[in-house]
Amino acid sequence: GSGIFQLRLQEFVNQRGMLANGQSCEPGCRTFFRICLKHFQATFSEGPCTFGNVSTPVLGTNSFVVRDKNSGSGRNPLQLPFNFTWPGTFSLNIQAWHTPGDDLRPETSPGNSLISQIIIQGSLAVGKIWRTDEQNDTLTRLSYSYRVICSDNYYGESCSRLCKKRDDHFGHYECQPDGSLSCLPGWTGKYCDQPICLSGCHEQNGYCSKPDECICRPGWQGRLCNECIPHNGCRHGTCSIPWQCACDEGWGGLFCDQDLNYCTHHSPCKNGSTCSNSGPKGYTCTCLPGYTGEHCELGLSKCASNPCRNGGSCKDQENSYHCLCPPGYYGQHCEHSTLTCADSPCFNGGSCRERNQGSSYACECPPNFTGSNCEKKVDRCTSNPCANGGQCQNRGPSRTCRCRPGFTGTHCELHISDCARSPCAHGGTCHDLENGPVCTCPAGFSGRRCEVRITHDACASGPCFNGATCYTGLSPNNFVCNCPYGFVGSRCEFPVGLPPSFPWVA
């Protein structure tokens, strides 16, 4: 602890100029004071001034008022500093002396004589308020006041608490009257050394070095550091933890940059045609009647559907067509005949049957021919009977469907599961795709069927084809091929045609 006992001398009265021994001072009592401060004693005794002592210069002669003086000799109030915890009790001895010698340092003069002394014993709490008192004896009177205050930076009832305001990285605070810390705005903690971060800053993913700040830890972003940063290069994907790249619907590949749903994202097929996805950026448009072109953007001639019968010739008109009928036929589509069986109207061996009492006829066509006059050869593929991309082929009187891999049945309507025979080795996961099964291999294996064990730097052998980029370290003991546009497969070995709905991990 550290404090100061302060004694303010106010007035001393010695009207007769007498000493304690009854003698008078000639020409008057040139008065100075000795003060002794010590621990509390019920009976004041001689001995060391344990709390301190001080002497004044000559302050006046006989009777005088003592003025306050803040510096130099004759300082008033008198200061008795101490470097211990103030006990709350004390004994004080104030002696008035006459000196015939030096005004400034009377202590050192020989022949000094005691005028009077007073002794005060009691309790005194630390505080700013002065305690005033007056002591009389038969010859003199002394008016004075005193108090105990703490030294700078010391606080509390006994001046025992040290506190120094500071504003650096070991604390940002001021001191309360009791010596406790009062944090500056924006700071917290026992020593006010912890900044209060921006409100809402994520506790784990963000921090701050000064108030109202939110600095993100690696892998996090956003004003409050509550948004993860996806894998570098992630195009159409999101993350729930840092460096993830979970693809949005319709996107695939390591960086979610392969468009698996070109139809939905770009709507390339026009005029009400049907769009079918066929791998990254791949699609086909199935046109409605009357349209053609890669995107069904071209309108067909109104005559394209061959509406004119019986050999009539078709002429396009605005929003319509017109049939020019051959001799013997009439009607909008030349469907009415003026011919009879006598005119031999049936071609390709068709049999003529008279109708309406010979005023018209009907042809019964042999196999593979059709039309009102058996003039058309039958095309059994016009109805698009083959499903799942199967190719229709005319075979004489019948037709057959040539199915794409993975499909079977008369109309290619049945899907074959290539994964049923478990083609993937070493615990690889099988995926049924249009062009056959594809295996996703566990760590440490590669190959189309996961049959190759990896024992070295997976990318060293250059396993990726068609200019693909090889990555290792994305998971233990494996590599990943990031395919260029137009190729898929674990090594980017397949041209577009099957959608990679999962990352290709070899």
Epitope: D152, N153, L162, K164, K165, R166, D167, D168, H169, F170, G171, G189, K190, Y191, D193, Q194, Y207, S209
Partner: antibody, heavy 121, light 106 residues
Framework: EVQLQESGPGLVKPSETLSLTCTVS??????????WGWIRQPPGKGLEWIGD???????YYNPSLKSRVTISVDTSKNQFSLKLSSVTAADTAVYYC?????????????WGQGTLVTVSS | SYELTQPPSVSVSPGQTASITCSGE??????VSWYQQKPGQSPVLVIY???TRPSGIPERFSGSNSGDTATLTISGTQPMDEADYYC?????????FGSGTKVTVL
């Protein structure tokens, strides 16, 4: 009890970068109660504070060295490091790492044993 | 920049009191630490926050700080106390060491 151990090359060529690492054992460098400092002492001379850092990476440097000093922390390894660039013979000193306690008003209650770094060609 | 000044040396007889001063502008308003360093050894903290002794430091070491001067006092000095002593304070965000005082026990 916490122990600090400096490591790094004892000889550095002029104009190069001095790099030292302090490994903390027996306590976590991630405590908010401490800053981790570097102090140096040229042969036969007094102590000079270089700078310090806390677990979050907040750094404070001696203004006279600030342009050349970088202090960093690696909480996963319980280490902090000093880099001093463009060194000259005047940077020859024993380099100490120390723990500065917030509760002690910034007093350094634990020190490494020090490592002598000589700058010479 | 802020500076702390110490006397280069102080001599004391065994059993006597050694006082080492450390002066700096407004030093009384800053917390002062004192370090003891023996030859070939790392510094050891003997006083922090002006007058507090860390555990393990003998009671003969005490400190005070007011005005522009901080003082480290070694009462009943022993031969083992012969060492260099450094005061240290924080000026804003910067640590500042005194120039050091060599204490010789005669």
């Amino acid at each position: 009890e916490v122990q600090l151990q400096e490591s790094g090359p004892g000889l550095v060529k002029p104009s190069e970068t001095l790099s030292l690492t302090c490994t903390v054992s027996g306590g976590s460098i991630s405590s908010s109660n401490y800053y981790w400092g570097w102090i140096r002492q040229p042969p036969g001379k007094g102590l000079e504070w270089i700078g310090d850092i806390n677990y979050n990476g907040n750094t404070y440097y001696n203004p006279s060295l600030k342009s050349r000093v970088t202090i960093s922390v690696d909480t996963s390894k319980n280490q902090f490091s000093l880099k001093l660039s463009s060194v000259t013979a005047a940077d020859t000193a024993v380099y100490y790492c120390a723990r500065e306690a917030v509760a002690l008003g910034g007093g350094a209650d634990d020190w490494g044993q020090g490592t002598l770094v000589t700058v010479s060609s | 920049s802020y500076e702390l000044t110490q006397p280069p040396s102080v001599s004391v007889s065994p059993g006597q009191t050694a006082s080492i001063t450390c002066s700096g502008e407004g030093l009384g308003d800053k917390y002062v630490s004192w370090y003891q360093q023996k030859p070939g050894q790392s510094p050891v903290l003997v006083i922090y926050e002006d007058s507090t002794r860390p555990s393990g430091i003998p009671e003969r070491f005490s400190g005070s700080n007011s005005g522009d001067t901080a003082t480290l006092t070694i009462s009943g000095t022993q031969p083992m106390d012969e060492a260099d002593y450094y005061c240290q304070a924080w000026d804003s965000e910067t640590g500042v060491f005194g120039s050091g005082t060599k204490v010789t026990v005669l």
